[in-house]
Interface confidence: medium
């Protein structure tokens, strides 16, 4: 059902838009998985509204979400990771709206970390390295990474490079000399799992050397 009304206290509930979106994070805390859902309309009155997931769970039929301010959250080992689960918004025992979702198709990886850039003078390049917790995971191991960098003064002029490894080389001649650059990286599932981009890693800032006038190369 799309609406719910009882004794006039929620008679306009059917006019509300209860559409929601969710993402899963697998092995986010040891062997525990998490599922996070939120309403797409930030103005929805969430008082008395609950989320429940049923199906494709191990040992239990359904699980209830915990509410954390405006998001709904589950952390559990009980996700089966096969088939579709039914996720419902409920008031009491009444379902307002439901979605069938395969949790392996809404995976949001953890953000990469330890991003750094090292200048190699002899090679005239910059080696970008970063780390990801997914290298140690059993499930979401294969990721595609998006490295984005820009000259600090160019607000929206990001250059993006997609790669599957955690190491990237930027050629010095492709960058402006004596400039401050900002670089960051995010990840998305590749291969079996599908889903969304992770949050961006914290940005790393680096400066390119000045041009050596005699040779036309950067210092």
């Amino acid at each position: 059902e799309s609406g719910y009304a009882q004794n006039g206290d929620l008679e306009d509930a059917e006019l509300d838009d209860y559409s929601f979106s969710c993402y899963s994070q697998l092995e986010v805390n040891g062997s525990q998985h998490s599922l996070t859902c939120a309403f797409e309309d930030p103005d929805v009155n969430t008082t008395n509204l609950e989320f429940e997931i049923c199906g494709a769970l191990v040992e239990v039929k359904c699980l209830n979400f915990r509410k954390l301010q405006e998001i709904y959250f589950i952390e559990t080992k009980k996700f089966l990771l096969i088939g579709k689960s039914n996720i419902c918004v409920k008031v009491g025992e009444k379902s307002l709206t439901c979605k069938k979702i395969d949790l392996t198709t809404i995976v949001k990886p953890e953000a990469p970390f330890d991003l750094s850039v090292i200048y190699r003078e002899g090679a005239n390049d910059f080696v970008v390295t970063f780390n990801t917790s997914h290298l140690q995971k059993k499930y979401v191991k294969v990721l595609m990474h998006d490295v984005a960098y820009r000259q600090e003064k160019d607000e929206n002029k990001w250059t993006h490079v997609n790669l599957s490894s955690t190491k990237l080389t930027l050629l010095q001649r492709k960058l402006q000399p004596a400039a401050m650059y900002e670089i960051k990286v995010r990840s998305i599932p590749d291969h079996y799992f599908k889903g969304f981009w992770s949050e961006w890693s914290p940005s790393y800032y680096f400066r390119t050397p000045e041009i050596n006038n005699s040779s036309g190369e950067m210092d």
């Epitope: 049923c54 199906g55 494709a56 769970l57 191990v58 040992e59 239990v60 039929k61 089966l80 990771l81 096969i82 088939g83 579709k84 069938k100 395969d102 392996t104 198709t105 059993k138 499930y139 079996y192 599908k194």
Partner: antibody, heavy 121, light 109 residues
Amino acid sequence: EVQLVESGGGLVQPGRSLRLSCAASGFTFDDHAMHWVRQAPGKGLEWVSGISWNSRGIGYADSVKGRFTIFRDNAKNSLYLQMNSLRAEDTALYYCAKDEYSRGYYVLDVWGQGTTVTVSS
Amino acid sequence: AIQLTQSPSSLSASVGDRVTITCRASQGISSALAWYQQKPGKAPKLLIYDASSLESGVPSRFSGSGSGTDFTLTISSLQPEDFATYYCQAFNSYPLWITFGQGTRLEIK
């Protein structure tokens, strides 16, 4: 009524190929993983292969890996098993089975009546 | 892959008897075990899932128990229609596979 009907079995020579089909009705086919299970004459049940609802999760028994291919067509509510390089030991009754993961995990709650594959020269 | 070993392989019993069949997994599988009944010339039928949950329409004389590596199927009072072969089944979701026990044939004494 939930129903699975297998077809495509028959007598085939060793080394040849055969394709089994399973027509599903009475349930939302693309909500469910599907499996092939076989039973050699007078023997027990042997899982052959399984495929997730969206075809991204696929598994095979070691005995058929590299020779058999499972695939599905959700638009036609159909499951298939392409069997290549057939051997005498593949002779069996082949069942198509529906997976009911809402039970908690891979549980085969509906089975077809099976189709017989005989590999002999 | 996990191996399932059923015991006994065959069993003779009389109508009204209480019968227990065991299934041992080579490694822990929590409660992820199902039991099936198969009669000659018929497809298998799901009896128990999640080690102890009774499938809809299955008589209450059937029950399942156990977790980890040791599981049992119990028929509290055998009926004539219960003489069949019984299989336990376990699974893995990633990579995907299913495995069956070798079966226990229950015959009339």
